[in-house]
Amino acid sequence: QQQTLPKPFIWAEPHFMVPKEKQVTICCQGNYGAVEYQLHFEGSLFAVDRPKPPERINKVKFYIPDMNSRMAGQYSCIYRVGELWSEPSNLLDLVVTEMYDTPTLSVHPGPEVISGEKVTFYCRLDTATSMFLLLKEGRSSHVQRGYGKVQAEFPLGPVTTAHRGTYRCFGSYNNHAWSFPSEPVKLLVTGDIENTSLAPEDPTFPADTWGTYLLTTETGLQKDHALWDHTAQNLLR
């Protein structure tokens, strides 16, 4: 006899990186017929939702109107059908950004390079932090970690046209509290025409949408929650 129901999916909209004082929605998708969903934060009950009518709803949304450092951390959700509870979802790491200061991002030898050249990004922040994160804008949401007292190096090695795109960095005060993003640095990689056609630039978003951290489209999120969970886990672990 089944003792628990399948685990639900959990994700954040528009993104798991949330600027402080901005809003975020945590979504939990379970099964039709679930009479109650519970959202847990760092092991404690955070919120409850009882969908109506339960037989027509398989997803609930928990709204956080004012993100702050107290709400940054790990979330999971469970749901109940009758008296039977589900397994807990994977953990969602919710990150608060725009804390304290803004790092400076630079690139060596420069923002315009030839395919095959070695490129290194440098992220500098003079306040007390030792972990830095380099993100490439676009759906793939590439993330690298670096460490250093006031500056971290991010060697990309010999680059290809696939490395083209816009990069930003963050200083991290802990796993779930990040600085303001740096100003963007656009890396241009020139190569032969054949390479370029085989490795087009990642789709990126215009600079004014970066503030919402829409690195993944909403439809993309809904299509593959597991991938989204996996991306967030890898970033923070």
């Epitope: 009950l45 955070f46 919120a47 409850v48 939702d49 009882r50 969908p51 609930v60 709204y63 956080i64």
Partner: nanobody, 126 residues
């Protein structure tokens, strides 16, 4: 901006009843999820009860069956009816709001609340 003002606190004997009120200013009350928390001397603030925009409720185990939370959107007020009071219910009671929110969301964790009242003292003693 939402302002919350609690009233109804006072001294009561064990087994007695009190009704706390929390009046909210502004037009956003109907879009708010509301909650009651309490803090006893020398202890951390703890969850008591909460109510969603759609009147769903949730209670701490310690008050279940004794306390009832309700709201009156026409009066911009949330209530906490407390009965069968015990000495361990002695605390400062705080009203809190999450504004805005979805209809069925009930918030249990204090971190979720973005507006707080100043509190009203409830003392239960013989």
């Amino acid at each position: 901006e939402v302002q919350l003002v609690e009233s109804g606190g006072g001294e009561v004997q064990p087994g007695g009843s009190l009704r706390l009120s929390c009046a909210a200013s502004g037009r956003t009350f109907a879009s708010a999820a509301m909650g009651w928390f309490r803090q006893a001397p020398g202890k951390e603030r703890e969850f008591v009860a909460a109510i969603s925009r759609s009147d769903d409720t949730y209670y701490a185990d310690s008050v279940k069956g004794r306390f009832t939370i309700s709201r009156d959107n026409a009066k911009n007020t949330v209530y906490l009816q407390m009965s069968s009071l015990r000495a361990e219910d002695t605390a400062v009671y705080y009203c809190a709001a999450v504004v805005p929110t979805y209809g069925n969301n009930i918030y249990v964790h204090s971190a979720a609340y973005n507006y707080w009242g100043q509190g009203t003292l409830v003392t239960v003693k013989p």
